[in-house]
């Protein structure tokens, strides 16, 4: 297939990736699906530099990222290894808190108002960030 060499309209390029920042809120699963339909994924933070870039663009607003533990282990949506990768949790987080009374614990990660991460109820309607890598094979079939 062809390769994407520049970011789509309304996406922001940074370090060979493209980012799209929502201005509305969705539950984590709906945000995840939105990104997939854009041939992208919820943002995967792999470095302090990328953390600062995303933080700068989202401001002090709760925002979903592509990290969850809905099936046990913490997993990044693109398969990046959680155990050995970059982490930026708030102190005492993640805590899988049950005190919210909504049922279950907290299985989805988001940026908090200071940029550090928290786990929260996946149904909460937070903003989200999509990411796609430049130079990766396009999802479109090649022209015949």
């Amino acid at each position: 297939g062809s390769e994407r060499t520049c970011c789509p309209v309304n996406w922001v390029e940074h370090e060979r990736s493209c980012y799209w920042f929502s201005r509305s809120g969705k539950a984590w699963a709906d945000a995840d699906n939105y990104c997939r339909l854009e041939d992208a994924h919820l943002v995967v933070v792999t470095s302090w530099e990328e953390q600062k870039f995303v933080q700068h663009h989202i401001g002090p607003v709760n925002t979903w990222m592509g990290l969850h533990d809905q099936n046990g282990p913490w997993k990044w949506v693109d398969g990046t290894d959680y155990e050995t990768g970059f982490k930026n949790w708030r102190p005492e987080q993640p805590d899988d808190w049950y005190g919210h009374g909504l049922g279950g614990g907290e299985d989805c990660a988001h940026f908090t108002d200071d940029g550090r991460w928290n786990d929260d109820v996946c149904q909460r309607p937070y903003r989200w960030v999509c990411e796609t890598e430049l130079d990766k094979a396009s999802q479109e079939p090649p022209l015949l």
Partner: antibody
């Protein structure tokens, strides 16, 4: 590979104390809530206690509240269960568990 | 507290059979339900999380379904290694509670 290894079980008299340990490896220990579950001989599974990843929240079954204390030491990747005022009905295999993985269990026998 | 019931308490089946185990919660637990398999003298093994999500490494012959109060675990093409006890557990709210178990043995 995720591994959980319990230790500290044994024979204790009613009213006595034991501390169980669970050594964890193969995962980022402080990122996960951890749980103790027990199984009396020939019986089903009973949830005992859960502690959040950083230890800020603890939860207990009514049957052990006030007698058992769950804790964790992230520097040692170890989960603990301090069991006081033990009763005959606490006799069971005690399992340390993460959502998707269980240890092999350690047997606690309370008998005079 | 949320009570969990399972049926049947035991069942006999043959190799190759398809068996279904039912789990019922005393109140709505959404999809906060897990299934575990336990063989004699061994620790439980996690099969299903979130009512229908297969744990990594678990064969697709195990299928979980349901939401709210009624859940099922279906095991297709039963093999000798599948003869064991099966437990459901709710993790909607504390105290977490297990069903009493279903023992699947060879007919």
């Amino acid at each position: 590979e995720v591994q959980l290894l319990e230790s500290g079980g044994g024979l204790v008299q009613p009213g006595g104390s034991l501390r169980l340990s669970c050594a964890a490896s193969g995962f980022s220990f402080s990122s996960y809530a951890m749980t103790w579950v027990r199984q009396a001989p020939g019986k089903g599974l009973e949830w005992v206690s859960t502690i959040s990843g950083r230890g800020g929240h603890t939860y207990y079954a009514d049957s052990v509240r006030g007698r058992f204390a769950i804790s964790r030491d992230s520097s040692k990747n170890t989960l603990y269960l301090q069991m006081n005022s033990l009763r005959a009905e606490d006799t069971a295999v005690y399992y340390c568990a993460k959502q998707d993985c269980w240890g092999q269990g350690t047997l606690v026998t309370v008998s005079s | 507290d949320i009570q969990m019931t399972q049926s049947p308490s035991s069942l006999s089946a043959s190799v190759g059979d398809r068996v279904t185990i039912t789990c019922r919660a005393s109140q709505d637990i959404s999809n906060y339900l897990a299934w575990f398999q336990q063989k004699p003298g061994k620790a439980p093994k996690s099969l299903i999380y979130a009512a229908s999500s297969l744990q990594s490494g678990v064969p697709s012959k195990f299928r979980g379904s349901g939401s709210g109060t009624d859940f099922t675990l279906t095991i297709s093409n039963l093999q000798p290694e599948d003869f064991a006890s099966y437990y459901c557990q709710q993790y909607h709210s504390f105290p977490f509670t297990f069903g009493p178990g279903t023992k699947v043995d060879i007919k």
